[in-house]
């Protein structure tokens, strides 16, 4: 009988397979409490019960059973603030990035039965409870309705709603994607007395139309009002209605600041300050001027007044206002002063305290790093995230500033908690930050924990991904490095994913993964097991991600370098990085590829067509090919207008089509979903046309009826399998 051969544990580990990735075998969990008070929260359990937790009494019980959820096939829920009712959401039907329609049922927790009579219509576009009591506001067929109680008949607040024409309380396509980043455009006042909403009038916006093939004999046409660069934009108006007696005064329009209303403009956000004070943010179409306007209710007038001395202007002289979006204010308890992130004199985004005017703002944070988000302002503390710690732009730590102290003292809440495992955090706070949850995304396994808001003491581990940890024990994961390289006066951070048995003396194929869009960040200290992890683990490919000029959180000089000239430095910096990687000695110069999706598809295409001979092949998924084809709000923010007297010349010079000839010496795989509402198939159609006209050979794949995410299971499997084959062929790797 042969003796058993001892194998060291390392050898028993297997490489990742593509199947692992496609099946989501190694996906992680996070735990975000659904806060309902200072010390209570709800959470949906693994078996779909909605469970109530009280941190202080340690009480927990099922508030809504999975059988009730199941009875209407509910996938989500929302508890009314008076805790008498729960809405149950079912028939989820995705529309665009954030928007979806659904059917809603109201369950009476007191009676233990569904509310009958005056049931909600279907499908509803958006629904929410008032912050107090159990009033309901909802949007149906582009109009807003109000219920004083769930069993009451509805009151119709707006009558102007029309499909693809006028949207009340929900954004149109461009505002949803490029400005609000939400599915809603209505906001309750803190006491539930007022409801503010936006009306978007798209009547004059050009329509993008594309075929949806479905299963029918004839395809149907999807029509979306979609303003491309330079086109007519939505006309926006903001209204506030008194929800106690909405039939008396009706919707009251909030005036637009004069300096904004004098030319094309955008509404950018609304923040309730108190029950009778609201803060609106506006932006000029040329997005370098933002105005924050504080408005007060005048009972005697039945009107909202926005005095000029309550207008605060934020202007950028080197680029656009804000980061990706203009930041929103975090108001103090006094309902007058607020904290806000904007660029300081050195061009780094920092927290400022505004008491009266922006000119007199007090800078709260400073340094050659950036404050990223203000989570919560309480009586004595301000919680924010930044990338200050140890100078890594791709980290996120949570800080607390004690604003009661003079001078304010700063403490990093997360920096030393689990230093190796956790360098990228977000947080979720209870109402007045009495407690908070921390969610760490990496670089190690994600972990969610509960903390005391006064002492920052960890109370409980909510989710630590033990199962995932166990299942990864026998997997050969690649090694991940985050480092920086220097070129001239520039510093570029990069992430390198190295095959498990990486040996610096050997040569490896290199794949660059690029996004590179303005104010984006790819080099982040987060955990991931995805396609590129597999390529490194199983196929022995070195992967690199590089944050070049135009990317975020490293100051405005770096960020605004791409202003009005997209497609230049983003590409140049990827090429610079590739040359530096070659110099490191372990890259096979004959086997270098680049791939990207969306903006990354644009950059990868331009990099392939750079004429440098650095790349053997590359892939562009759903690329932008011309900024004239993309949404006005996005394109114009970074490129200005495509007019002769503005920036038409660079709009024309920066297209992928203009470089068609340069694809002759690379293998190019172009991929796009035909039902892409975001980056229209038109973009790839025009690249293909230009390549054909130039008689350049290339490969292409379309995904019928798939949108910008190519998300359907079958399509994703096909997509990643197809890209894997293409890369392995390019790198001469055997199957």
């Amino acid at each position: 009988r042969p003796s058993r051969v001892y194998k060291p544990e390392g050898n028993t580990k297997r490489a990742l397979t593509l199947k692992d990735i496609l099946n989501g075998t190694f996906s992680y969990k996070t735990y975000f409490p659904n806060w309902i008070s200072e010390q209570e929260y709800l959470h949906q359990s693994e078996d779909d019960n909605i469970v109530f937790y009280n941190i202080e009494t340690r009480e927990s019980y099922i508030i809504l059973s999975n059988s009730t959820m199941k009875s209407v096939n509910a996938t989500d829920y929302g508890l009314s603030p008076d805790r008498q009712f729960v809405y149950l959401e079912s028939d989820y039907s995705k529309l665009w990035r954030y928007s979806y329609t659904a059917t809603y049922y109201i369950y009476d927790l007191q009676n233990g039965e569904f509310v009958r009579g005056y049931e909600l219509p279907r499908p509803i576009q958006y629904l929410c409870w008032s912050p107090v009591g159990s009033k309901l506001a909802y949007v149906y067929q582009n109009n807003i309705y109000l219920k004083q109680r769930p069993g009451d008949p509805p009151f119709q607040i707006t009558y102007t709603g029309r499909e693809n024409r006028i949207f009340n309380g929900i954004p149109d396509w461009v505002y949803e994607e490029e400005m609000l980043a939400t599915k809603y455009a209505l906001w309750w006042s803190p006491d539930g007395k007022f409801l503010a909403y936006v009306e978007f009038n798209d009547s004059d916006i050009p329509i993008i139309a594309y075929s949806y093939y479905g299963d029918g004999q004839y395809p149907r046409t999807i029509n979306i009002p979609y303003p491309k660069a330079g086109a007519k934009n939505p006309v926006v108006r903001v209204f506030i209605v008194d929800t106690t007696y909405p039939h008396h005064v009706g919707p009251m329009e909030v005036p637009v600041p004069e300096m904004i209303a004098s030319s094309d403009y955008y509404f950018s956000w609304l923040t309730w300050v108190s029950s009778e004070r609201v803060c609106l943010q506006w932006l000029k179409r040329v997005q370098n001027v933002s105005v924050l306007s504080i408005c007060d209710f005048r009972e005697d007038w039945h009107a909202w007044e926005c005095p000029k001395n309550q207008e605060h202007v934020e202007e950028s002289r080197t680029g656009w206002a804000g980061g990706f979006f203009v930041s929103t204010p975090a108001f103090s308890q006094d309902a007058t002063s607020y904290y806000k992130i904007f660029s300081d004199k050195d061009g780094y985004k920092h927290i400022h305290y505004i008491k009266d005017t922006v000119e007199n703002a007090i800078q709260i944070t400073s340094g050659k790093w950036e404050a990223i988000y203000i989570f919560r302002v309480t009586q004595d503390s301000l919680f924010y995230s930044s990338n200050e710690f140890e100078g890594y732009p791709g980290r996120r730590n949570i800080y607390r500033i004690s604003i009661g102290n003079s001078p304010p003292s700063k403490k990093c809440v997360t920096c030393h908690l689990r230093k190796e495992r956790c360098q990228y955090y977000t947080a979720s706070f209870s109402y007045k930050a009495k407690y908070y949850a921390l969610v760490c995304y990496g670089p190690g396994l994600p972990i969610s924990t509960l903390h005391d808001g006064r002492t920052d003491q960890e109370i409980q581990v909510l989710e630590e991904n033990k199962e995932l940890e166990n299942s990864l024990r026998n997997i050969q994961l690649p090694k991940v490095e985050i480092k920086k390289l220097k070129d001239g006066g520039l510093t570029f951070w990069y992430k390198m994913i190295l095959p498990p048995q990486f040996d610096r003396s050997k040569k490896y194929p290199l794949l660059i993964q690029v996004y590179g869009g303005p104010c984006s960040q790819s080099v982040k200290s987060v955990f991931a097991v995805n396609w590129i992890t597999y390529l490194a683990s199983k196929e022995g490919i070195v992967i690199a991600l590089v944050d070049g000029r135009g990317t975020a959180f490293q100051g405005d000089k770096f960020l605004h370098a791409v202003y009005r000239k997209l497609g230049v430095y983003e590409v140049e910096d990827q090429l610079t990085a590739v040359r530096k990687f070659i110099e490191m000695g372990f890259i096979d110069e004959e086997r270098i590829a680049i791939w990207g999706w969306s903006y990354g598809g644009y950059v990868s295409s331009l990099a392939l067509a750079s004429g440098t001979g650095l790349f053997k092949c590359g892939i562009a998924v759903a690329p932008v090919s011309s900024w004239e084809y993309y949404a006005s709000i996005y394109s114009e923010r970074f490129m200005g207008l495509p007019t002769k007297d503005d920036n038409l010349e660079h709009y024309k010079n920066s297209t992928v089509m203009a470089r068609a000839e340069y694809f002759r010496n690379v293998d190019y795989l172009l991929i796009h979903g035909t039902a892409d509402d975001n980056v229209h198939f038109q973009n790839s159609a025009q690249i293909a046309k230009a390549l054909v006209n130039a008689q350049v050979d290339f490969q292409a794949m379309w995904y019928s009826d798939q949108n910008h995410g190519i998300l359907s299971g079958r399509s994703q499997n096909h997509l990643y399998t197809h890209m894997t084959h293409f890369l392995k062929q390019c790198f001469s790797l055997s199957d």
């Epitope: 005056y118 039939h247 008396h248 009107a303």
Partner: antibody, heavy 117, light 108 residues
Framework: EVQLLESGGGLVQPGGSLRLSCAAS????????MSWVRQAPGKGLEWVSA????????YYADSVKGRFTISRDNSKNTLYLQMNSLRAEDTAVYYC??????????WGQGTLVTVSS | EIVLTQSPGTLSLSPGERATLSCRAS???????LAWYQQKPGQAPRLLIY???SRATGIPDRFSGSGSGTDFTLTISRLEPEDFAVYYC?????????FGQGTKVEIK
């Protein structure tokens, strides 16, 4: 306190037109939603039309839709009701009232419109 | 449209007596949207009650409103001589806003 004063009523033949005005005192007229309510002789009250504040959205009773037009001139603090294709059944006292669809808290004294041949 | 039916059509009472006026809706009305008006001959209507139970400015506390859903009531606890008039209920729940046909409170 808001004061409302209607004018423009009178005798008109069927098919004819009339324009009613309602002058409002108070500097914040532009923010008020306003309505026209009528009362046929010896009968009850009937809502005719409404216009929202600065938004200027308009609403009509089915009985007058397509014939009557409500409008406002906020610079003149005045509400109007343009009545075309008048019928005998439009004979009534026309009141302007402050309010959108209800809680009509201020009313004018009314102006009589008589449609007769 | 929502039809409001008031009863009785006429109520004959003496000063000092209690008057109870009823208003029934053809479909449910949230109490927020129900109002009562008083109208005297040759005068414009006057808002008495809004939100089914809240008194308008300057309205004496002998006037009170109650009810929900489809049944609403206006009560005048002790009739004063100036209270003899026609009373209308009105809903603003739905367009078109509608009024009841009125209840006449007359001196017995």
């Amino acid at each position: 306190e808001v004061q409302l004063l209607e004018s423009g009523g009178g005798l008109v033949q069927p098919g004819g037109s009339l324009r009613l005005s309602c002058a409002a005192s108070g500097s914040t007229f532009s923010s008020y939603a306003m309505s026209w309510v009528r009362q046929a002789p010896g009968k009850g009250l009937e809502w005719v039309s409404a216009i929202s504040g600065s938004a200027g959205y308009t609403y009509y009773a089915d009985s007058v839709k397509g014939r009557f037009t409500i409008s406002r001139d906020n610079s003149k603090n005045t509400l109007y009701l343009q009545m075309n294709s008048l019928r005998a059944e439009d004979t009534a006292v026309y009141y302007c009232a402050k309010g959108w669809f209800g809680n009509f808290d201020y009313w004018g004294q009314g102006t009589l419109v008589t449609v007769s041949s | 449209e929502i039809v409001l039916t008031q009863s009785p059509g006429t109520l004959s009472l003496s000063p000092g007596e209690r008057a109870t006026l009823s208003c029934r809706a053809s479909q449910s009305v949230s109490s927020s949207y129900l109002a009562w008006y008083q109208q005297k001959p040759g005068q414009a209507p006057r808002l008495l009650i809004y939100g089914a139970s809240s008194r308008a400015t300057g309205i004496p506390d002998r006037f009170s409103g109650s009810g929900s859903g489809t049944d609403f009531t206006l009560t005048i606890s002790r009739l004063e001589p100036e209270d003899f008039a026609v009373y209308y209920c009105q809903q603003g729940q739905q367009i078109p806003p509608t009024f009841g046909q009125g209840t006449k409170v007359e001196i017995k």
